[in-house]
């Protein structure tokens, strides 16, 4: 644990002359900050700066150029990195008094005049004098109220509901505060706060609306923090709903939003009776104009097997909401004529998911598919090519002999997607062709045998093998294969001499 920071001057309290300057130095083993009486708006004449010194300690100086009654209060120096909400502000304190003959009491905000008492608890009526020597009395409608007074805090006691006034006399001049109203309140020990933003994405010129609702609490202070706050851009409203239970609805409206209004919108509710605080936050983004982003979950070339069911999912981010359509080969997809369906589902505020579903893929489903997303500001599309993969099959296997030369050509026509490869095998011993070991693959480099392949279209291929001379009966096998399957057919090639003998016979 770090030892507490130290303050110079090393005093519990100090009286500073009106309009004079004063400075407080804080020394700590880690970075230190100051907490002081005025709010940020009132503290234009309070300067805080870091100072270098050779002691190895961190030094932060608080300087007031012209002390006024409003500077009266508790100044606390603390380690700023160790602050946790439920812990005491851990630091060193000094109380500064700035006596002002014309200002007997430290100026207060209007909410300070409302004193909330809970269940007969003691309360503090916070009239603090600018001079510790000033005598003060507390009065209500019945006269002087006996209560203990501490010039640093005010009157402490158990007070009945009603108005109270503090009275002081400075150099023969009498001062009275405006009435402090003591109010009894039933408050819950927790704050039930809900935030609602119907939209978190906007474009320039639109109106941002955020609401925060506090339930079952009568007196709540709610502060908004948002990007346009410094410019006073937001309009705040409070609606009190009493039926069926108390509900305070605070609305922040930012008209004519710009990109600079993007950021965190936070409402912080604080219960008047105690330091119970609850915060809620939403992140709003404002875009110069509408936008569309398309994120496919698949590539630009996709394959589907024949009869397969396949889904193609595209994520779309868009604002304002997009219209989404699908095209096939640049024509609108007519779903009712095909076993293809599309749908669009809203996943989040600006996220959509569109699916193209192929129910039972057919060859004719191959083609170019395009998703088009458009709104009033943007159009985006994504196109992919779909190939329906079909197992290879042999359409035709025929031979063609070359008359007297004794040469013969075998043609094998096959189809499939991807285009099948064609392989040739021969069996030279016709009696043993039932045995698989009798078949050999026909190599390309065998003399007097020529093999060639021609593709007829995207899915049909023709392979040819030409035998310069067939001297004995052989069997030829055409094997067509692709990724999805293989098929083979066989054909007998009879030597021309044998054929003529057969013809004579």
């Amino acid at each position: 644990q770090l030892s507490l920071p130290s303050i110079l001057p090393n005093e519990n309290e100090k009286v500073v002359q009106l309009n004079s300057s004063f400075s407080l130095r804080c020394f700590g083993e880690s970075e230190v900050s100051w907490q002081y009486p005025m709010s940020e708006e009132e503290s234009s004449d309070v300067e805080i700066r870091n100072e270098e010194n050779n002691s190895g300690l961190f030094v932060t100086v608080l300087e007031v150029s012209s002390a006024s009654a409003a500077h009266t209060g508790l100044y606390t120096c603390y380690y700023n990195h160790t602050q946790t909400e439920e812990n005491e502000l851990e630091g060193r304190h000094i109380y500064i008094y700035v006596p002002d003959p014309d200002v007997a009491f430290v100026p207060l905000g209007m909410t300070d005049y409302l004193v909330i008492v809970e269940d007969d608890d003691s309360a503090i009526i916070p009239c603090r004098t600018t001079d510790p020597e000033t005598p003060v009395t507390l009065h209500n409608s019945e006269g002087v109220v006996p209560a203990s007074y501490d010039s640093r805090q005010g009157f402490n006691g158990t007070f009945t509901v009603g108005p109270y006034i503090c009275e002081a006399t400075v150099k023969g001049k009498k001062f009275q505060t405006i009435p402090f109203n003591v109010y009894a309140l039933k408050a819950t020990s927790e704050l039930d706060l809900e935030m609602e933003a119907l939209k978190t994405v906007y474009k320039s010129g639109e109106t941002i609306v955020v609401t925060c609702a506090v339930f079952n609490n009568e007196v709540v202070d709610l502060q908004w923090t948002y990007p346009g706050e410094v410019k006073g851009k937001g309009i705040t409203m409070l609606e009190e709903i009493k039926v069926p239970s108390i509900k305070l609805v605070y609305t922040l409206t930012v008209p004519e939003a710009t990109v600079k209004d993007s950021g965190d919108y936070e409402c912080a509710a604080r219960q008047a009776t105690r330091e119970v605080k609850e915060m809620k936050k939403v992140t709003i983004s404002v875009h110069e104009k509408g936008f569309i982003e398309i994120k496919p979950t698949f590539s630009q070339l996709e394959a589907v097997n024949l009869h397969e069911v396949k889904h193609f999912v595209v994520e779309v981010r868009a604002y304002p909401p997009p219209r989404i359509s699908w095209l096939k080969n640049n024509l609108t997809l007519i779903e009712n004529l095909t076993e293809i369906t599309t749908d669009v589902e809203k996943i989040q505020e600006i996220r959509y998911r569109s699916k193209l579903k192929l129910i039972r893929a057919k060859e004719e489903d191959s083609g170019h598919y395009t998703i088009v997303a458009q709104n009033e500001d943007a159009v985006k599309s994504y196109t992919f090519e779909l190939l329906t993969q079909v197992p290879s099959s042999i359409l035709d296997l025929v031979d063609d002999h070359h008359g007297s030369t004794g040469g013969q050509t075998v043609r094998c026509t096959a189809e499939g997607t991807p285009l099948p490869d064609i392989e040739w095998m021969i069996c030279k011993d016709i009696k043993k062709c039932n045995n698989e070991t009798s078949w050999t693959i026909l190599a390309n480099n065998v003399s007097n045998i020529i093999t060639e392949i021609h593709s007829r279209d995207r899915s049909t291929v023709e392979g040819r093998v030409t035998f310069a001379k067939v001297e004995e009966t052989i069997a030829v096998r055409c094997l067509a294969k692709n990724l999805l399957g293989a098929e083979n057919r066989e054909l007998k090639l009879v030597a021309p001499t044998l054929r003529s003998e057969l013809t004579v016979a």
Epitope: H81, T82, T84, E86, N87, E88, S189, R274, E275, M279
Partner: antibody
């Protein structure tokens, strides 16, 4: 060094009450918020309640609201958890936890835990 | 309340390998996130706070990153003593909530 020692756990019947205590030492107890966190057998951690350094604020997880009360006695450096109308689902090891003693916001010191078993 | 979701539920890693644990918050918790390690029969121990600040005495092989809703705890080279259950916890909102835990076990 910082020490948190829980006591008061045991076996109790459903609907009955139990009071857990946590004795703190090694730091300025009156300056720090204190929490109770529990862990059912074989399960994860669940935050139960917090009390501000000065006792003025108390928060609870919804499942124990109205049944459990967290309190502290800064003069005795002791944290308490009064558990009424106990249910079987309250069976857990209860840890007393210090917050922000050396770091910001996180639970930096834990006791060894005390087992509460609610069973008929 | 903010729901914290950790993944995976169990991570099997060999000693010396890197382990990466994820924690997701149902809404932004800024950098108000802590990581704890718990071994059987022991109380949890704070490792990381402020999403990425390592507690004094915690080995440098432990590191945290992320802000908003997505967070990661990385253990660069697992030692035998690192096999345990790890929890993330947010302290941005009441009630404080923990993730369900990730068990890091020996592969």
């Amino acid at each position: 060094q910082v020490q948190l020692v829980e006591s008061g756990g045991g076996v109790v019947q459903p609907g009955r009450s139990l009071r857990l205590s946590c004795a703190a030492s090694g730091f300025t107890f009156s300056r720090y918020g204190m929490h109770w966190v529990r862990q059912a057998p074989g399960k994860g951690l669940e935050w139960v309640a917090v009390i501000w350094y000065d006792g003025r604020n108390k928060y609870y997880v919804d499942s124990v609201k109205g049944r459990f009360t967290i309190s502290r006695d800064n003069s005795k450096n002791t944290l308490y958890l009064q558990m009424n109308s106990l249910r079987a689902e309250d069976t857990a090891v209860y840890y007393c936890v210090g917050v922000g003693i050396t770091v910001t916001g996180a639970f930096d010191y834990w006791g060894q835990g005390t087992l509460v078993t609610v069973s008929s | 309340e903010i729901v914290m979701t950790q993944s995976p539920a169990t991570l099997s890693v060999s000693p010396g390998e890197r382990a990466t644990l994820s924690c997701r918050a149902s809404q932004s918790v800024r950098s108000n996130l802590a990581w704890y390690q718990q071994k059987p029969g022991q109380a949890p121990r704070l490792l990381i706070y402020g999403a990425s600040t390592r507690v004094t005495d915690i080995p440098t092989r432990f590191s945290g990153s992320g802000s908003g809703t997505e967070f990661t705890l990385s253990i660069s080279s697992l030692q035998s003593e690192d096999f345990a259950v790890y929890y993330c916890q947010q302290y941005n909102n009441w009630p404080r909530t923990f993730g369900q835990g990730t068990k890091v076990e020996i592969k």
